[in-house]
């Protein structure tokens, strides 16, 4: 009878994670007498992954009916792979002893593993850029294999070139991760705009993952101020307005001054949005000019997202505005609380 | 079902020969290593002989150049051969399958019962 | 050739009873030891094998332990149809051998 040969026809297997992978092995002969063996790997590390002989190997299941002598295909099923699962493969006959001694080993199958990436994680900048500034993004998917995989970036459906990929490690591994970092150009229309990372794999099927990024977590449009007169409203009655305009994101704080002293602080509450996703907001002061001598200089100071305050002014000419008569003295001489100056918002 | 039956017993004087036969069925009898037991009356058990797949033969020192092991395929039989019987051979003879990849005893047939006696 | 030995030779148990029974070989045999059961005037049934694993349709009140020299077949609730003979054999190389036996009897 002709030497007992360990057939492995599948020089390789590729298999999606969480499924089963059959490997094929068949013996020519039924002599000499002992167990088939599959190990990963070779060597004197190699992992025991099946032994006909003994043991317990919830994972491994037999293709074929192995009661019977006559059976010589000694194929086996792995369910439930991992990517850690990767590897080759042996099919070893051994001959019966103390010990068994290995007779023979099959050449070896390939076992790939198939793992979907990760959904791609996109991370921006740790503090708020204003337009004109250009920003980093970064994309972060994990746990894929093969190592082929594709990733583009965009930024409102618009597809970004600049951008720097790298898929680590850069050798065999039973799984990889890809990390990728895009340089982006803030305009003061970008409080709705998207940036998309893009992974394509060929576990995906055509169906790319994507994850996303707000830039309206990332921008900050600073506002701008227009202080301006208004007719007046009663006798020796001015109104003064700040309008605060364009400005992301809400938090703001106006301060009125007068002639440099504080006169009064509110926190933006009830703005107007635009289109563009930024706020409008505006503040009023009514001046009871008769309580003044001289000219004002009324400045309306903003605090917008922590930055540091910005200003207008505007010179209130109390000379244009005949007093009344003894007001002024009144209100010095009593030394009232009655304010000489009125605000409100909106 | 997997069946093995023993035939061929009986009384024989010294110095003859029987032979022994076992008809197996519920399995091809070909592709397993196929053995010989005996059981001396109120003794223990011995095992006798045997045949592997390719058709090479084993035998207990006792029993070498006197006993020969054979099978017929084509009868899906084992056969045992014995001369120059002793008194010492009289036991009962068992038909005995080899297991699948160890050649562990699985199957054993109902006897035979040879008596060697003048 | 291999020798096996058997302990003890006789034993004498009771229903219910956990009972061990040793078996050691001349030399190293790997697992290659099976244990059987013979009742009188009965062909021997086939137990154990690879000094561990149960033949089909074997109750698993029935278990094996050992490799290389030592081996043990436990019983662990006696039952009145447990009362019978047992052998151990090796087969690790020709010629396979027997232990001489361990009668077991109802006390």
């Known amino acids: 009878e002709e030497e007992l040969q360990v057939i492995q026809p599948d020089k390789s297997v590729s298999v999606a994670a969480g499924e089963s992978a059959i490997l094929h092995c068949t013996v020519t002969s039924l002599i000499p007498v002992g167990p088939i063996q599959w190990f990963r790997g070779a060597g004197p590390a190699r992992e025991l992954i099946y032994n006909q002989k003994e043991g317990h190997f919830p994972r491994v299941t037999t293709v074929s009916e192995s009661t019977k002598r006559e059976n010589m295909d000694f194929s086996i099923s792995i369910s439930n792979i991992t990517p850690a699962d990767a590897g080759t493969y042996y099919c070893v006959k051994f001959r019966k002893g103390s010990p068994d001694t290995e007779f023979k080993s099959g050449a070896g199958t390939e076992l790939s593993v198939r793992a979907k990436p990760s959904a791609p994680v996109v991370s921006g900048p740790a503090a708020r850029a204003t337009p004109q500034h250009t920003v980093s993004f970064t994309c972060e998917s994990h746990g894929f294999s093969p190592r082929d995989i594709t990733l583009k970036w965009f930024k409102n459906g618009n597809e970004l070139s600049d951008f720097q990929t790298n898929v680590d490690p850069v050798g065999e591994s039973v799984s990889y991760s890809i990390h990728s970092t895009a340089k982006v150009v803030l305009t003061r229309e970008d409080v709705h705009s998207q940036v998309i990372c893009e992974v394509a794999h060929v576990t995906l099927q055509g169906d790319p993952l994507r994850g996303t990024a707000n830039l309206s977590e990332t921008i900050r449009v600073p506002p701008t101020l227009e202080v301006t007169q208004q007719p007046v409203r009663a006798e020796n009655q001015v109104n003064v307005t700040c309008q605060v305009r364009k400005f992301y994101p809400q938090r703001l704080q106006l301060t009125w001054l007068e002639n440099g002293n504080v006169s009064r602080t509110e926190t933006a509450s009830t703005v107007t949005e635009n289109k563009d996703g930024t706020y409008n907001w505006m503040s009023w002061l009514l001046v009871n000019v008769s309580a003044h001598r001289d000219d004002v200089k009324l400045t309306c100071q903003v605090e917008h997202d922590g930055q540091p305050a910005v200003s207008k002014s505007h010179d209130l000419k109390v000379s244009a505005h005949p007093k009344e008569q003894g007001s002024n003295t009144a209100a010095e001489n009593t030394g009232s609380n009655e304010r000489n100056i009125y605000g409100g918002s909106g | 079902e997997v069946q093995l039956v023993e035939s061929g017993g009986g009384l024989v004087q010294p110095g003859g020969s029987l032979r022994l036969s076992c008809a197996a069925s519920?399995?091809?009898?070909?592709?397993?290593?196929m053995h010989w037991v005996r059981q001396a009356p109120g003794k223990g058990l011995e095992w006798v002989s045997a045949i592997g797949t390719a058709g090479d033969t084993y035998y207990t020192g006792s029993v070498k150049g006197r006993f020969t092991i054979s099978r017929e395929n084509a009868k899906n039989s084992l056969y045992l051969q014995m001369n120059s019987l002793r008194a010492g051979d009289t036991a009962v003879y068992y038909c005995?399958?080899?297991?699948?990849?160890?050649?562990?005893?699985?199957?054993w047939g109902q006897g035979t019962m040879v008596t060697v006696s003048s | 050739d291999i020798q096996m030995t058997q302990s003890p030779s006789s034993l004498s148990a009771s229903v219910g009873d956990r009972v061990t029974i040793t078996c050691r070989a001349s030399?190293?045999?790997?697992?290659?030891l099976a244990w059987f059961q013979q009742k009188p005037g009965k062909a021997p049934k086939s137990l154990i094998y690879t000094a561990s694993s149960l033949h089909s349709g074997v109750p698993s009140k029935f278990s094996g332990s050992g490799s290389g020299t030592d081996f043990t077949l436990t019983i662990s609730s006696l039952q009145p149809e447990d009362f019978a003979t047992y052998y151990c054999?090796?087969?690790?190389?020709?010629?396979?051998?027997f232990g001489q036996g361990t009668k077991l009897e109802i006390k």
């Open positions: 054999q090796q087969y690790v190389s020709y010629p396979y051998t």
């Open positions: 005995v399958r080899g297991g699948v990849w160890d050649d562990a005893f699985d199957i």
């Open positions: 519920g399995f091809t009898l070909s592709s397993y290593d």
């Open positions: 030399q190293d045999i790997n697992n290659y």
